[in-house]
């Protein structure tokens, strides 16, 4: 390495050191940088900007040091191509600010910014919070005011410093299938930069029309379907301090529906059902035409659904060790303000031991009553599934 006279010299198998004074004005297109994990830059007064594409191709970079150089500006998306970056040292440069967006999405273990003329502004509130909360090793110096000797309160006490406030106004009335729904996103805050809707969950649930601009964005959902239920409609906004977003769900009313499946024997017995409807329907079971009162031996158990974005609920009428007295017709009635539905199924769990054909031979036993009984051991699973 001592004999290297290039602008940048390799260090170990995946490091690069650029310390020859005044030889670099950009990091774009560093040679052999493909699997670089460490880049050290020093004494480069002409290196003044770090832009979006400057670190393209450095996907493996873990540590970046640019010190004692002329860096004045780091683009908010400068580290887009280095998602694995965990150590960032930009000390002793000419940075007056650094956007929160620059480090967003990175898992930084330490960030060093000492020796920069950082100006006390709302744009650096995120940095002060990191320091206060020890979110990673942050090394800076006291933030400077614009005038000499000015005593600045910590930024957190400056009430005008804050992320935007975002609120979504929704219709108060209930929404039904086929309706048009207008949502309004109201944004308040200092130095608002941009705002928009996130509508990725809404594909196929309605036609969407955006309108308006900061500080009030409109969204019309045309001809909504019941699939819109449980889907997030999100509005976000950004300023110097950070990003805020808020989500709402539009509730689209529709009538109850119900489906019953054939009884299946698991550890216990289960009569599977699916119910849908908005609002969520109330359920009532009937056995042979009479109301079935649920107990710890016969009760409704909903299945935990991995899908939280749908209104349909699945479950079981669970029967613990049912006997012949439980054989019969089971009906599930589901009802909500928009309608009701019912489904029935016959279930036979066990033959009646007291029913016999008079022509069958009657068994006669001369041996004493057998007290031995096969003992069945249900195994309780580790996760305590009932």
């Amino acid at each position: 390495a001592a004999s290297c006279r290039e602008t940048c010299c390799p260090v170990g198998p995946s490091g690069l050191r650029c310390t020859r004074a005044g030889t670099l004005n950009t990091l774009r297109g560093l040679r052999g940088a493909g699997n670089l994990t460490e880049l050290y830059v020093e004494n480069q007064r002409d290196l003044q900007r770090l832009e979006f594409e400057d670190l393209q191709g450095l996907g493996e970079l873990r540590s970046l040091t640019i010190v004692k150089s002329g860096l004045r500006f780091v683009a908010p998306d400068a580290f887009h191509f280095t998602p694995r970056l965990s150590h960032l040292n930009l000390s002793s440069n000419a940075l007056e600010s650094l956007s929160w967006k620059t480090v967003q999405g990175l898992s930084l273990q330490d960030l060093t910014l000492s020796g920069n003329p950082l100006h006390c502004s709302c744009a650096l509130l995120w940095l002060q919070r990191w320091e206060q909360e020890d979110l990673c090793g942050v090394y800076t110096q006291k933030l400077q005011g614009s005038g000499s000797g000015d005593q600045f309160l910590p930024l957190g006490h400056n009430n005008s410093c804050g992320v935007p406030s975002v609120k979504i106004q929704m219709p108060n009335d209930s929404v039904e299938v086929g309706d048009d729904v207008f949502l309004q996103c109201q944004v308040e805050g200092q130095a608002l930069q941009q705002a928009d809707w996130i509508l990725t969950e809404l594909e196929g649930t309605a036609t969407m029309k955006k309108s308006g601009d900061l500080p009030s964005l409109g969204l019309t959902l045309v001809n909504v379907t019941s699939d819109l239920n449980k889907k997030n409609v999100t509005c976000w906004a950004e300023n110097d301090v950070g990003r805020a977003e808020v989500s709402v769900q539009v509730s689209v009313s529709f009538p109850a529906s119900v489906h019953l499946g054939k009884a299946v024997e698991q550890h216990h017995w289960c009569i599977p059902f699916s119910v849908d409807g908005q609002p969520a329907p109330s359920l009532r079971w009937f056995f042979n035409g009479s109301v079935l009162n649920e107990t710890s031996f016969i009760f409704t158990q909903f299945l935990e659904s991995a899908l939280t974005n749908e209104t349909m609920r699945h479950g079981c009428l669970r029967l613990n060790q049912p006997t012949h007295v439980n054989n019969g017709n089971y009906t599930l009635l589901a009802a909500n303000p928009y309608g009701q539905a019912a489904a029935s199924i016959m279930a036979a769990f066990m033959d009646n031991p007291f029913e016999f054909n008079p022509e069958d031979p009657i068994p006669v036993s001369f041996s004493p009553v057998d007290t031995n009984s096969t003992s069945r051991d249900p195994v309780e699973k580790k996760d305590e599934t009932p």
Partner: antibody, heavy 117, light 109 residues
Framework: QVQLQQPGVELVKPGASVKLSCKTS????????MHWVKQRPGQGLEWIGE????????NYNEKFKNKATLTVDKSSSTAYMQLTSLTSEDSAIYYC??????????WGQGTTLTVSS | QAVVTQESALTTSPGETVTLTCRSS?????????ANWVQEKPDHLFTGLIG???NRAPGVPARFSGSLIGDKAALTITGAQTEDEAIYFC?????????FGGGTRLTVL
């Protein structure tokens, strides 16, 4: 492991009310029914009622319908039994017991309730 | 309300087999009664042993078994041990409520 924790002792005055607790751990609280049982010296065990922790559905022994109210707090995985208008007849040990499949399998250690002026 | 009757006390010796029974005032005990057997040891330590007549609860030793003998539910301890000395309660389910027996005090001498 499955645990049902009950306070050891409650001392209350006649005519008052008391809320007994049964804090659970080691299993998914909302998947099971919880039962409450009364034990008086020389009088064996009496079943008070049951509650489904998932939705608060209850069934009571007729004898205790106007005496006991069963509730659950899912956030703390705790079952409760409130007893009202207490008299000396309510002095007893009260147990919570978990229902799994066809078993009253796990029991609390009981709360000794003394009703005395 | 139904009454459930058990032997008030039984004595056995270590290694012996002993059977405790549980009778219902409403007639024969059936599978619909989901007969449970619960053990009480000193300091009010209750443990569920048997449920649904003959299902052993997880972790219960195999020497405990449940059955129907005639019109009664039964708990059999095959090869009793000194630590089995306890009070054993039978509980029967009647459609929507449990009724407990008075308990059998088992002494293992």
């Amino acid at each position: 492991q499955v645990q049902l924790q009950q306070p050891g002792v409650e001392l209350v005055k006649p005519g008052a009310s008391v809320k007994l607790s049964c804090k659970t751990s080691g299993y998914t609280f909302t998947s099971y029914w919880m039962h409450w049982v009364k034990q008086r010296p020389g009088q064996g065990l009496e079943w008070i009622g049951e509650i489904y922790s998932s939705n608060g559905l209850t069934n009571y022994n007729e004898k205790f319908k106007n005496k006991a109210t069963l509730t659950v707090d899912k956030s703390s995985s705790t079952a409760y039994m409130q007893l009202t208008s207490l008299t000396s007849e309510d002095s007893a040990i009260y147990y919570c017991a978990r229902h799994w499949y066809v078993f009253l399998d796990h029991w609390g250690q009981g709360t000794t309730l003394t009703v005395s002026s | 309300q139904a009454v459930v009757t058990q032997e008030s006390a039984l004595t056995t010796s270590p290694g012996e087999t002993v059977t405790l029974t549980c009778r219902s005032s409403t007639g024969a005990v059936t599978t619909s009664n989901h007969a449970n057997w619960v053990q009480e040891k000193p300091d009010h330590l209750f443990t569920g042993l048997i449920g649904g007549i003959n299902n052993r609860a997880p972790g219960v030793p195999a020497r405990f078994s449940g059955s129907l003998i005639g019109d009664k539910a039964a708990l059999t301890i095959t090869g009793a041990q000194t630590e089995d000395e306890a009070i054993y309660f039978c509980a029967l389910w009647y459609s929507n409520h449990w009724v407990f027996g008075g308990g059998t005090r088992l002494t293992v001498l």
